[in-house]
Interface confidence: low
């Protein structure tokens, strides 16, 4: 075993733009880590036979499989894939070892399986294996985090029910509004699972894994602030917990706080208490109202009432299964090219929503924003005034919703031709919709003023990929015209643009655009 | 519904202890905070003394070092040992779990 070469076989994933990958696979960019496999001897097996370690990958992910090979001379090799012999090119780095790469661009299940490289060096042969599978993302869950109270302590605990184990972190935030995005400077993040301090303004907690995050924010009523016109509205599904902060700051203890469901107590063991005092020697007491889990006739509005504070109340609403509430009807609209414009969309949904902006087949980030009505709502500004169909999507553990939007932008429209040996068309996009005319220059119309009414055919086409309408114009070639300069020209209520095109012989015709 | 009931107080020389009871229905107890508060004739009633689920205590600065609070959850009782009584600490002695108060204990100080 004196000659036997070292082997190094590492595996090499790729961030998923895809602009880290190399397309060829022998030369691949390596912007990531290398993970080593191993490249253990398999015992006995015939020949000299290296097995590297399982390699699981998530569906569209790109890696490249590695191998160094530390062996004088030069090396020949072949990767075989279910059979097939894939080209191999192995190459030298600074080290002078033998590389041997073999890139997967976006895996999917057929590119699954063993792949096996045979190499070749001046000493020996041998044979490295790889298994490659493709991860089981299907069992992967991400559950929105729930609260419990830890057991004789006063804290909450924060619980994800996902697979993988997601990361768990406090987001808390000790002022008002805007001020609260998770950029802001006034947020402070804590990856723990157990919160102790709990008088905050508000207090989220997040769990985040590879299918992304999800977050719950403590539903809080705070005695100190001005109550809302409407009333404050918490969704929840038969069976999960429910959890309702009551907080309150008075300049002393003189004040004690309650629950009421109903204008009735809430039962024992349905809230417990905490206080402190603040820099300023006020004190902040909060009253949590919990039910482990919920059950229809936990519907109703809770009521937080202090000896030293008006009351104010929420509406908890427990519902069999999730939902979203918002007009689905499509909506069209019409703006000029540099209007400042944003599509909206309001809603009230349960759980809450993921969704897209989609334009032209891309999809575009979405936010939500929360109104003071217990609606939230989704705007989308980057349209870049590009007309045609945008699409909303939302949906929920329970739930889908689509909502078709058109925009239309105002504008003269922009004649392109094209012609063949027996018609010429003209195209337009510009909008409202234009009208068009034909004409023909000749000898006694140098100004090209004679209208061409026959063999006209006018249409409105809409133009897939963004959606948006083009309206165009073909002429039917008869011999009255043939060999003359004709003139399309569109026209709507903000102006003119024609093509002149010369009708004579099948090719490449010269277009002069004169607007 | 939780129900307080207060026990011990009397009538007492000044810089004699004494120690006040506030005994509680409801499996609540544990989880609660309590404070003991007072009323002197004529007064409003001021808060003395807190302690928390926890046992954290806390206590109105003039009082600190007389008077300590303590609860025991297996008896779902907390108390207040008050010692070198002042005639200034004649009162109705409440205790207050959430909303919840009890019925007040008389204490008077007095040579």
């Known amino acids: 075993n004196q000659d036997l070469p070292v082997i190094k076989c590492v595996l090499i994933n790729h961030k998923n733009n895809d602009s880290s990958v190399g397309k060829s696979s022998s030369y691949p960019m390596v912007s990531e880590s290398p993970e080593d496999l191993g490249c253990a001897l398999r015992p006995q097996s015939s020949g000299t036979v290296y097995e590297a370690a399982a390699v699981e990958v998530d569906v569209s992910a790109s890696i490249t499989l590695q191998v160094l090979v530390d062996a004088p001379g030069n090396i020949s090799c072949l990767w075989v894939f279910k059979h097939s012999s894939l080209n191999c090119q192995p190459h030298f780095d600074l080290q002078n070892r033998g590389v041997v790469s073999m890139v997967i661009l976006k895996m999917t299940e057929t590119q699954a399986g063993e792949y096996l490289l045979f190499i070749q060096s001046e000493a020996t042969n041998y044979t490295i294996l790889f298994t490659v599978s493709i991860r089981n993302t299907l069992l992967y869950t991400l559950r929105r985090p729930y609260f419990r109270k830890m057991e004789n302590q006063d804290a909450l605990v924060c619980i994800s029910e996902s697979v993988p184990e997601p990361i768990v972190e406090w987001v808390l935030c000790d002022s008002q509004g805007e001020s609260c995005k998770e950029e802001s400077p006034a947020v402070v993040k804590k990856e723990e699972k157990v919160l102790h301090e709990l008088f905050g303004t508000d207090i989220r907690c997040c769990a985040r894994n590879e299918l992304g995050r999800e977050c719950t924010r403590l539903f809080t009523i705070d005695l100190n602030q001005t109550p809302q016109t409407t009333l404050p509205q918490l969704f929840l599904k038969v069976g999960e917990p429910l959890w309702i902060r009551c907080k309150a700051v008075h300049v002393n203890h003189g004040f004690g706080l309650t629950w009421e469901l109903e204008n009735k107590a809430l039962e024992e063991g349905n809230y417990f208490e905490m206080s402190t005092y603040s820099t300023n020697r006020t004190m902040i007491r909060i009253l949590f109202a919990f039910v482990s889990s919920v059950a229809r006739n936990d519907t109703g509005y809770y009521t937080c009432s202090s000896s030293k504070h008006p009351s104010q109340s929420a509406l908890v609403t427990i519902v069999e299964k999730g939902f979203i509430n918002a007009t689905n009807s499509s909506e069209d609209y019409e703006i000029d090219q540099y209007e400042e414009f944003c599509f909206s969309v309001r809603f009230k949904a349960y759980p809450q929503i993921r969704c897209t902006w989609t334009f032209s087949r891309k999809s575009f980030p979405c936010e939500q924003k929360g109104l003071d009505n217990g609606y939230s709502i989704s705007k989308f500004c980057n349209h870049k005034h590009q007309p045609g169909e945008y699409i909303f999507h939302a949906e929920n553990d329970d739930a889908q919703f689509t909502k078709m939007f058109t925009l239309n932008i105002r504008r003269k429209p922009q004649v392109l031709a094209e012609a063949s040996a027996s018609q010429a068309s003209c195209f337009s996009d510009g909008y409202p919709l234009p009208s068009w005319t034909w004409k023909k220059c000749s000898d006694k119309s140098p100004n090209c003023t004679e209208e061409i009414t026959e063999g006209v055919w006018n249409r409105k086409a809409n133009r897939k990929v963004f959606g948006q309408w083009v309206s165009s114009s073909t002429l039917n070639m008869s011999e009255a015209i043939k060999g003359f300069l004709v003139k399309c020209c569109a026209y709507n209520s903000l102006g003119t643009s024609c093509e002149t095109i010369l009708l004579n012989s099948p090719g490449p015709f010269p277009f002069i655009q004169d607007n | 519904q939780v129900q307080l009931q207060e026990s011990g107080g009397g009538l007492v020389q000044p810089g004699d202890p004494l120690r006040l009871s506030c005994a509680a229905s409801?499996?609540?107890?544990?989880?609660?905070?309590i404070d003991w508060y007072r009323q002197a004739p004529g007064k409003q009633r001021e808060w003395v003394a807190q302690?928390?689920?926890?046992?954290?205590?806390h206590y109105e600065p003039s009082l600190k070092g007389r008077f300590t609070i303590s609860r025991d959850n297996a008896k779902n009782t907390a108390y207040l040992q008050m010692n070198s009584l002042k005639p200034e600490d004649t009162a109705v002695y409440y205790c207050?779990?959430?909303?919840?108060w009890g019925q007040g204990t008389q204490v008077t100080v007095s040579s």
């Open positions: 207050r779990i959430l909303d919840y």
């Open positions: 409801g499996s609540t107890f544990s989880r609660n905070y």
């Open positions: 302690i928390t689920s926890g046992g954290n205590t």
